[in-house]
Amino acid sequence: HNTTVFQGVAGQSLQVSCPYDSMKHWGRRKAWCRQLGEKGPCQRVVSTHNLWLLSFLRRWNGSTAITDDTLGGTLTITLRNLQPHDAGLYQCQSLHGSEADTLRKVLVEVLADPLDHRDAGDLWFPGESESFEDAHVEHSISRSLLEGEIPFPPTS
């Protein structure tokens, strides 16, 4: 799996989308998990409703929400009030029994808020030593811009 990069601004919301084949994954619940280390397990953060028919319901775990458009084949995860510690590797998963198929590998990057002039030294970016040659960047800054406000250019 290639890794898709989603960039969000600290303190704001980031929306991650994971497309999938709706027929192949028909009847399957979905989950969002955080990768613990390069070879470590993927720790479940939140999963869709226990009743697959109600997968459209937004389910929360803390500041993370998940909702699934089972007809359109799009899983959507919202990270509310994005913080530096939210940066890292995640997976969208399709569950079947005790197994889980990876729908998408996601790298979440947290960018400094351009309107916040505090020290941004604790913000996390993927280091040069980490190889994401196949990474595809999706700029997903979800804050609506105010009238006359200059959009902060995300770094890639």
């Epitope: 226990n50 697959w52 028919l53 109600l54 459209f56 319901l57 389910r59």
Partner: antibody, heavy 121, light 106 residues
Framework: QVQLVQSGAEVKKPGASVKVSCKAS????????MHWVRQAPGQGLEWMGI????????SYAQKFQGRVTMTRDTSTSTVYMELSSLRSEDTAVYYC??????????????WGKGTTVTVSS | DIQMTQSPSSLSASVGDRVTITCRAS??????LNWYQQKPGKAPKLLIY???SLQSGVPSRFSGSGSGTDFTLTISSLQPEDFATYYC????????FGGGTKVEIK
């Protein structure tokens, strides 16, 4: 107006099966899920399962898995709930209820009047 | 499954009283809670959905509040037609109802 009309009362022997119907009118049948909820005499409400009238997909409460079957007939806008291997504890009023939902809410807004099922030898 | 505990199981009140019924979930259910009213021999009727939204046609004396694990249904001024049994229902997980609270005439 939106209405759910259920079939009449049934008396069954232990081990038998019962099939209760619920006919919908006043709205687009395939646009709303349907639920079945039962209530034993003097007891609370117990959710049994859900059916999507559009595709026929179902989900059942674990307690009823293997004993309950929910089906629908789109030509008559009717859903059915069949419960097999009946026992005395299944004596209850069985309700169908329409489900309405969005990303942050879900509720049962219209209910049938209920069908009394009595299981007795 | 998530367990819903309602309290009290019954209460006696007079017309005009302010009545409060509580519902506690065995784990957090966000705001995914509904309240229903049921009168003897009748089907349940939706009062409040998503913890605090009043269903169309329901009198404004009914209100709901809470999130997480603790929820409250309040009737600000009890009317004769409000004597009934009230149920909470969670929908964060497989649907479960509370045991009910019977509101009787004092």
């Amino acid at each position: 107006q939106v209405q759910l009309v259920q079939s009449g009362a049934e008396v069954k022997k232990p081990g038998a099966s019962v099939k209760v119907s619920c006919k919908a009118s006043g709205y687009t049948f395939t646009s709303y899920y349907m639920h079945w909820v039962r209530q034993a005499p003097g007891q609370g409400l117990e959710w049994m399962g859900i059916i999507n009238p559009s595709g026929g997909s179902t989900s059942y409460a674990q307690k009823f898995q293997g004993r309950v079957t929910m089906t629908r007939d789109t030509s008559t806008s009717t859903v059915y709930m069949e419960l097999s291997s009946l026992r005395s504890e299944d004596t209850a009023v069985y309700y169908c209820a329409r489900g309405v939902g969005g990303q942050d809410y879900y509720y049962m807004d219209v209910w049938g009047k209920g069908t009394t099922v009595t299981v007795s030898s | 499954d998530i367990q819903m505990t309602q309290s009290p199981s019954s209460l006696s009140a007079s017309v005009g009283d302010r009545v409060t019924i509580t519902c506690r979930a065995s784990q957090s259910i966000s705001s995914y809670l509904n309240w229903y009213q049921q009168k003897p021999g009748k089907a349940p009727k939706l009062l409040i959905y998503a913890a605090s939204s009043l269903q169309s046609g329901v009198p404004s004396r009914f209100s709901g509040s809470g999130s997480g694990t603790d929820f409250t249904l309040t009737i600000s001024s009890l009317q004769p037609e409000d004597f009934a049994t009230y149920y909470c229902q969670q929908f964060d997980d497989v649907f479960t109802f509370g045991g009910g609270t019977k509101v009787e005439i004092k």
